[in-house]
C-alpha cells in the first residue's frame, strides 16, 4: 500500500480582515492510525492552531466530522481573521505512540494572507490663515491598513501635486501600518474655492481608492485692495466719499473712518457682494459737510481685515474752492452712510 | 478637539487582572488613527505596550504578548486595556493616546496604577 | 528591539541659553524618530515628527535634526516653562521603543 501523503492543495490564500480563512488539507490513506495538527509555521518555535485530539481552539471549526472513521478530509476554518494570523500554515498527521504520538507527515503548507482596508485619509492643513503667495504644508494619514504596499497622491483642484513626503510606519514587520505624508501648496488669490485632495490607492479597495480633502477657503486670507473716491455734490455743502473694499477672504472685515486723524465711525461688513471666485467686495461712504470748514480734510478709510494689522488708504478733502466730481461710483451697494458737520 | 481620558481601579492585587478604558471625545475612534496604551515607570521610563486600530486589529509590544488584550467599543467611542497576571512590576501612570504614524500626537492625562496585595 | 540612549541624563540651564539634547538609536533608523516634552504631572506633548519636521502650536525655538543613529533636539533660547523630560522614540521598528529622557532644570 502506497505511503499517506498530506495534500494542502492551496500554496496560498488570501484574506480580508474579520473574514474567515479556509485552509485545505486531505490525507491520502487512513494509515497509519494518529491525529492531524495544524500549526502556524516550522522548526521548534511553531506555533500550535489546532489539534484534532485535545485543546480547547475558539476559532477553528473543522470542515469535516473528524470523528468519522473513514474520514480523510483535515481541513481547517479560522474565524475572524486578523492580519496577525498571517503566516504560513502546516497540517502534520501523527502516528499513534507511546507515550506520545510521533510526527508522521506534513503537508507543504499554506501562506495565509491577510488584508486590511486603509481608514478614510484624513486631510489637514496649517493651524493659521496664510495669504497668496505663501507656501503651506497639509498633512494626510490613514491607518490600519496591510499589506504594507500603499500609494497615495496628492491633487489641488484635479491636478496632480509633485512636492510631497509620504512616510509609511512602520518599516519594519507589523499586523497593520500608517501612512503619513505632507504637501507643500503654494496659494494663489484664485484658491478661495480650491481643494486639496489626498487621494489613497491600496489593493483592499479593488481600484477604488479613498480620498480627503481640505477646502483651501479654510486655509486662505486674501488681503484687500482699498480704494478712496470723491463723488459728485449731492448739495452745495455737501461731499460723498466712498472707500471700495474689493478681493477679500474671509468676510470677517472692519471699517473705521477717520476725520483728520479722528475717528469718525465704525462699522462691520455685513452685506458684501461676492465676486466669482469666492472673494468679497464690500463698500462704505460718508457724507461730509464741508460748508463751514476753512482747512482741507484727511479722510481716511482704515480697514481691519481678519484680525491682521489695520490697512489704510487716504483722501484729501479740498474745502477752499466749489468741490468737484474727482471719481465715480463703481461698487455695486452703498452699504453704510454717515453724515458729518465740521465746524 | 481630540481628548482622551483613562479611567479604572487604582490598586490591583498581585496574579489578578488591570482593566482600564479610555473614553475617546473629539474623534470617532471608528473613522481612523491607531489607539495605544503606554505606561510610565518611575525613573523616566515610557514604554509602549500595544495599540488597536480604528477598525480592530491589535498590536502588541512581544514582552507582554501573553498577558496583554486591547479591545474596543466604537458605539461607546472606548478602548480597553486588560492586562491578565500583575505583579508589582506593573505598577506604572498608564497613558491611553492616539497615534499619527509612528508616533502619539494626542496624550490622555494618565491613571496611576498600584500592584500590592 | 531598538535601543534608544539619551543624553545628558540632567541638564541645569539658564533662561536664554541654547541648549543641545542628544538621542542615539542602537541600529540605523532613518529619520523615524519622534521627539516629546513632559512636564511634572503632565502627561507627553508631541514636540517633533519624523526627526525635523515641526508640530503646529509648537514654540519655534525647538529644532532638531539628524538621521541614522544619531539624532538632536535643539531648543533656541530656553525660557522657564521648557523645564521637564525630554524624550525620544524610536518610530522605525516596532515595539515602539522611547529613550530614558533627559532632565530639564533651570538654575
Known amino acids: 500500500e502506497e505511503e499517506l501523503q498530506v495534500i494542502q492543495p492551496d500554496k496560498s490564500v488570501l484574506v480580508a480582515a474579520g473574514e474567515t480563512a479556509t485552509l485545505r488539507c486531505t490525507a491520502t490513506s487512513l494509515i497509519p492510525v494518529g491525529p492531524i495538527q495544524w500549526f502556524r509555521g516550522a522548526g521548534p518555535g511553531r506555533e500550535l492552531i489546532y489539534n484534532q485530539k485535545e485543546g480547547h481552539f475558539p476559532r477553528v471549526t473543522t470542515v469535516s466530522d473528524l470523528t468519522k472513521r473513514n474520514n480523510m478530509d483535515f481541513s481547517i476554518r479560522i474565524g475572524n481573521i486578523t492580519p496577525a494570523d498571517a503566516g504560513t500554515y502546516y497540517c502534520v498527521k501523527f502516528r499513534k505512540g507511546s507515550p506520545d504520538d510521533v510526527e508522521f507527515k506534513s503537508g507543504a503548507g499554506t501562506e495565509l494572507s491577510v488584508r486590511a482596508k486603509p481608514s478614510a485619509p484624513v486631510v489637514s492643513g496649517p493651524a493659521a490663515r496664510a495669504t497668496p503667495q505663501h507656501t503651506v504644508s497639509f498633512t494626510c494619514e490613514s491607518h490600519g491598513f496591510s499589506p504594507r504596499d500603499i500609494t497615495l497622491k496628492w491633487f489641488k483642484n484635479g491636478n496632480e501635486l509633485s512636492d510631497f513626503q509620504t512616510n509609511v510606519d512602520p518599516v519594519g514587520e507589523s499586523v497593520s501600518y500608517s501612512i503619513h505624508s505632507t504637501a507643500k501648496v503654494v496659494l494663489t488669490r484664485e484658491d478661495v474655492h480650491s481643494q486639496v485632495i489626498c487621494e489613497v490607492a491600496h489593493v483592499t479597495l479593488q481600484g477604488d481608492p479613498l480620498r480627503g480633502t481640505a477646502n483651501l477657503s479654510e486655509t486662505i486670507r486674501v488681503p484687500p485692495t482699498l480704494e478712496v473716491t470723491q463723488q459728485p455734490v449731492r448739495a452745495e455743502n455737501q461731499v460723498n466719499v466712498t472707500c471700495q473694499v474689493r478681493k477679500f477672504y474671509p468676510q470677517r472685515l472692519q471699517l473705521t473712518w477717520l476725520e483728520n486723524g479722528n475717528v469718525s465711525r465704525t462699522e462691520t461688513a455685513s452685506t458684501v457682494t461676492e465676486n466669482k471666485d469666492g472673494t468679497y467686495n464690500w463698500m462704505s461712504w460718508l457724507l461730509v459737510n464741508v460748508s463751514a470748514h476753512r482747512d482741507d480734510v484727511k479722510l481716511t478709510c482704515q480697514v481691519e481685515h481678519d484680525g491682521q494689522p489695520a490697512v489704510s488708504k487716504s483722501h484729501d478733502l479740498k474745502v477752499s474752492a466749489h468741490p468737484k466730481e474727482q471719481g465715480s461710483n463703481t461698487a455695486a451697494e452703498n452699504t453704510g452712510s454717515n453724515e458729518r458737520n465740521i465746524y | 478637539d481630540v481628548q482622551l481620558q483613562e479611567s479604572g481601579p487604582g490598586l490591583v492585587k498581585p496574579s489578578q487582572s488591570l482593566s482600564l478604558t479610555c473614553t475617546v471625545t473629539g474623534f470617532s475612534i471608528s473613522r481612523g488613527y491607531d489607539w495605544h496604551w503606554i505606561r510610565h515607570f518611575p525613573g523616566n521610563i515610557l514604554e509602549w505596550m500595544g495599540y488597536i486600530t480604528y477598525s480592530g486589529i491589535s498590536n502588541y509590544n512581544p514582552s507582554l504578548k501573553s498577558r496583554i488584550s486591547i479591545t474596543h467599543d466604537t458605539s461607546k467611542n472606548h478602548f480597553f486595556l486588560r492586562l491578565n497576571s500583575v505583579t508589582a512590576e506593573d505598577t506604572a501612570t498608564y497613558y491611553c493616546?492616539?497615534?499619527?504614524?509612528?508616533?502619539?500626537?494626542?496624550w490622555g492625562q494618565g491613571t496611576l496604577v498600584t500592584v500590592s496585595a | 528591539d531598538i535601543v534608544m540612549t539619551q543624553s545628558p541624563a540632567t541638564l541645569s540651564v539658564t533662561p536664554g541659553d541654547r541648549v543641545s539634547l542628544s538621542c542615539r538609536a542602537s541600529q540605523s533608523i532613518s529619520d523615524s524618530l519622534h521627539w516629546y516634552h513632559q512636564k511634572s504631572h503632565e502627561s507627553p506633548r508631541l514636540l517633533i515628527k519624523?526627526?525635523?519636521q515641526s508640530i503646529s502650536g509648537i514654540p519655534s525655538r525647538f529644532s532638531a535634526g539628524g538621521s541614522g543613529s544619531d539624532f538632536t533636539l535643539t531648543i533656541n533660547s530656553v525660557e522657564p516653562e521648557d523645564v521637564g523630560v525630554y524624550y525620544c522614540q524610536n518610530g522605525h521598528s516596532l515595539p515602539w521603543t522611547f529613550g530614558g529622557g533627559t532632565k530639564l532644570e533651570i538654575k
Open positions: 493616546a492616539r497615534g499619527g504614524g509612528a508616533w502619539f500626537t494626542y
Open positions: 519624523y526627526a525635523s
